[in-house]
Amino acid sequence: RKIPKVGHTFFQKPESCPPVPGGSMKLDIGIINENQRVSMSRNIESRSTSPWNYTVTWDPNRYPSEVVQAQCRNLGCINAQGKEDISMNSVPIQQETLVVRRKHQGCSVSFQLEKVLVTVGCTCVTPVIHHVQ
Amino acid sequence: GITIPRNPGCPNSEDKNFPRTVMVNLNIHNRNTNTNPKRSSDYYNRSTSPWNLHRNEDPERYPSVIWEAKCRHLGCINADGNVDYHMNSVPIQQEILVLRREPPHCPNSFRLEKILVSVGCTCVTPIVHHVA
């Protein structure tokens, strides 16, 4: 999947653009908004009818090295009595994000952008009753 | 930066941390090959905390289109299909990394940017504060 070129109708390439070798791009990994903090609603992962836990995945050859993944706690959803309702299902909500992968080939190093699917949380759904024979 | 284990046989000049600027291949590797997007494509309608998806487009960013979730109701949908206001629909937010063209309008020069997106909604029990 290639990053789309800027359409000429919208932009002209400015003279100030840095020279870049063919087939690659220059990437500054000093993150814009690095210090913005998420004001997460208070522990929604425990108060949800489809509660979830968080696990941290760590990979030193990935930037960022830490990626947090959610895992639904139950198969069913939690009803008003605090019991699991198995006629409903807790399903994962997922979102793609980008990471930079560092690859070692012998003593040389290359960098590759990767799309990673992150499970963000869970929601309670009614399954489609659609039996396939 | 983060520390990288180095091949002990390699010259010692290599920096252990990720450099501030890197050259990366234009092709983006997709690790999500084992997922079926059709399966979750209509959770927004079938959830007890349904949401609408709004298109956020920015040609200076990659991906240029990001879909933002907005919860449809304050309450959650009960077994009878009615909105139950004893429960709350709340957005699930996630910080994701995108590419920002920098300098602006340049085709092959980017900077990573962290943005906050609402991915979907979940139904929660409200925290009840009893005022004495």
């Epitope: 069913g76 198995i86 006629s87 399903v91 009753i129 | -």
Partner: antibody
Framework: EVQLQQSGPELVKPGASVKISCKTS????????MHWVKQSHGKRLEWIGG????????SYNQNFKGKATLTVDKSSSTASMELRSLTSEDSAVFYC????????????????WGQGTSVTVSS | QIVLTQSPAIMSASPGEKVTMSCSAS?????MHWFQQKSGTSPKRWIY???KLASGVPARFSGSGSGTSYSLTITDMEAEDAATYYC?????????FGAGTKLELI
């Protein structure tokens, strides 16, 4: 063709633990739930619990909480169940059984079964 | 938990005979599901969502019922139908099975 291949029979001593496995083929392992069912003396079936590899969700019958632990290994498309602190009451045939995907069918909608693993607890 | 009571526990039928077995739930359920098990083999999905026949199940089988009362019927008993039939519900946690009805061939 959907297949659930369970590990072989086990003879274990009281107080010990046992782990039985269920290797799957013929479908996308991640997308479907795996349940475990106990059958004592060729009679009543008792649901132990289920696990969904994609969502990470698990659900246990209260009667088996602390007795059974369900896990999955996505890389080998294998589900496993560990039973601990075994007593003679735990002697039974244990089945893995595929449940729904939470999308087309409910997670608890069981369709395919493994051939069963016999566990005998005896000193 | 919902207790499923199957009756009769054991029954016999001749080839060609009509067979009906029942499953009573201690609380109302939306659907009932049935599994067939022959001696020494694993159970097979037989009827789901009260009345839908699983793939490969002969049309002589049918399921019906609602609320707390459900049944499985065979219009013309055949030798291969001799087995134990279990009803099952997943309307309420935990998922439960009945004790089974053993159907024997006369």
């Amino acid at each position: 063709e959907v297949q659930l291949q369970q590990s072989g029979p086990e003879l274990v001593k009281p107080g010990a633990s046992v782990k039985i496995s269920c290797k799957t083929s013929g479908y996308t392992f991640n997308e479907y739930t795996m349940h475990w069912v106990k059958q004592s003396h060729g009679k009543r079936l008792e649901w132990i619990g289920g696990i969904n590899p994609n969502s990470g969700g698990v659900s246990y019958n209260q009667n088996f909480k602390g007795k059974a632990t369900l896990t999955v290994d996505k890389s080998s498309s294998t589900a496993s169940m560990e039973l601990r602190s075994l007593t003679s009451e735990d002697s039974a045939v244990f089945y893995c059984a595929r449940g729904g995907d939470g999308y087309y069918t409910n997670y608890f909608d069981i369709d395919y079964w493994g051939q069963g693993t016999s566990v005998t607890v005896s000193s | 938990q919902i207790v499923l009571t199957q009756s009769p526990a054991i029954m016999s039928a001749s080839p060609g005979e009509k067979v009906t077995m029942s499953c009573s739930a201690s609380s109302s359920v939306n659907y009932m599901h049935w599994f067939q098990q022959k001696s020494g083999t694993s159970p097979k999905r037989w009827i789901y969502d009260t009345s839908k026949l699983a793939s490969g199940v002969p049309a002589r089988f049918s399921g019906s019922g609602s609320g707390t009362s459900y049944s499985l019927t065979i219009t013309d008993m055949e030798a291969e139908d001799a087995a134990t039939y279990y009803c099952q519900q997943w309307n309420s946690h935990p998922l439960t099975f009945g004790a089974g009805t053993k159907l024997e061939l006369i």
